[in-house]
Amino acid sequence: RQQWELQGDRRCQSQLERANLRPCEQHLMQKIQRDEDSYGRDPYSPSQDPYSPSPYDRRGAGSSQHQERCCNELNEFENNQRCMCEALQQIMENQSDRLQGRQQEQQFKRELRNLPQQCGLRAPQRCDLEVESGGRDRY
């Protein structure tokens, strides 16, 4: 069994290396940016709309194109739930230092958890996406 797990890990590792998860990152960032531009940024000050809506993010087409490409990539992990989770964790890790607020991080995490379902794929049952804002100190 240990041998099988080792092979499974290796197979997952090579799948992750081959996969291009950027479209997923782009899709998710556009999605949460659009939501925030629409509803204002700070849920604690509803009277304040720190960032006004912007036509820049109303494109939609670009985002759906990213989503389609993202789903194609995630499809590769359909038969390996643990590997699907690792792909989601990698997306979280890659974007965590862009998210400098708890709300932004939670929203990104929510969208990320829903991603497999949006793609018509099974979502991993248990998948820990915890990373504090800023991820690891990369600089």
Partner: antibody, heavy 118, light 111 residues
Framework: EVQLVESGGGLVQPGGSLRLSCAAS????????MHWVRQAPGKGLEWVSA????????YYADSVKGRFTISRDNSKNTLYLQMNSLRAEDTAVYYC???????????WGQGTLVTVSS | EIVLTQSPATLSLSPGERATLSCRSS???????????LDWYQQKPGQAPRLLIY???KRASGVPARFSGSGSGTDFTLTISSLEPEDSALYYC????????FGGGTKLEIK
């Protein structure tokens, strides 16, 4: 309304220490990355340091690394900058700023002046 | 370290004219998520800076429509379509791709 009030500035001799504070109100302080930015008299803006909302991640400009320490007390809604081994070139107005959540400096305090001179 | 170079250092124009401020980065500011991590800030004498534009082209709330940001990669522009007397100020670009760094600033004078 978001308010950021800096304090702790003053005159200090080269080699001395100073601790700046920034009292925050009007938003959920423990939900945002916070920054220190400085501006020497008649000069441009220089980003100094930042700290993530839980305090786990700390970032510093090369010019202050090893001398300055950023910290926060989320129970007191306060941001700090401990400045050691101060030099004449650290003389500046120090601003504290709140991150938008996406790495932009959305709200700023009015600043506190630090003068390093003998 | 990413270095931002702003030009011109000083710009002197009349009310109603169009102002074009430039910011050039020593490396691309496009993140893998597709966004350009470049902001523009305005600072008037004796005041704290104010965010005008974030992520290269998005206008912060309360910022008049005459302010717009454009560019991608290493070359960015802040345009003020029709200058008002109150636009007289210092303008800074700031990158947020790798930690944070400001450009040297452009002083905009209204004749």
């Amino acid at each position: 309304e978001v308010q950021l009030v800096e304090s702790g500035g003053g005159l200090v001799q080269p080699g001395g220490s100073l601790r700046l504070s920034c009292a925050a109100s009007g938003f959920a302080f423990n939900d945002y990355t916070m920054h220190w930015v400085r501006q020497a008299p008649g000069k441009g803006l220089e980003w100094v340091s930042a700290i993530s909302y839980g305090g786990t991640n700390k970032y510093y400009a090369d010019s202050v690394k090893g001398r300055f320490t950023i910290s926060r007390d989320n129970s007191k809604n306060t941001l700090y900058l401990q400045m050691n081994s101060l030099r004449a070139e650290d003389t500046a107005v120090y601003y504290c700023a709140k991150d938008s959540g996406y790495r932009s400096l959305l709200h700023w305090g009015q600043g506190t002046l630090v003068t390093v001179s003998s | 370290e990413i270095v931002l170079t702003q030009s011109p250092a000083t710009l002197s124009l009349s009310p109603g004219e169009r102002a074009t401020l430039s910011c050039r980065s020593s490396q691309s500011l496009v993140h893998r998520n597709g966004y350009n991590y470049l902001d523009w800030y305005q600072q008037k004498p004796g005041q704290a800076p104010r965010l005008l534009i974030y992520m290269a082209s998005k206008r912060a709330s309360g910022v008049p429509a005459r302010f717009s940001g454009s560019g991608s990669g290493t070359d960015f522009t802040l345009t003020i379509s029709s200058l008002e007397p109150e636009d007289s100020a210092l303008y800074y670009c700031m990158q947020a791709l790798q930690t944070w760094t400001f450009g040297g600033g452009t002083k905009l004078e209204i004749k």
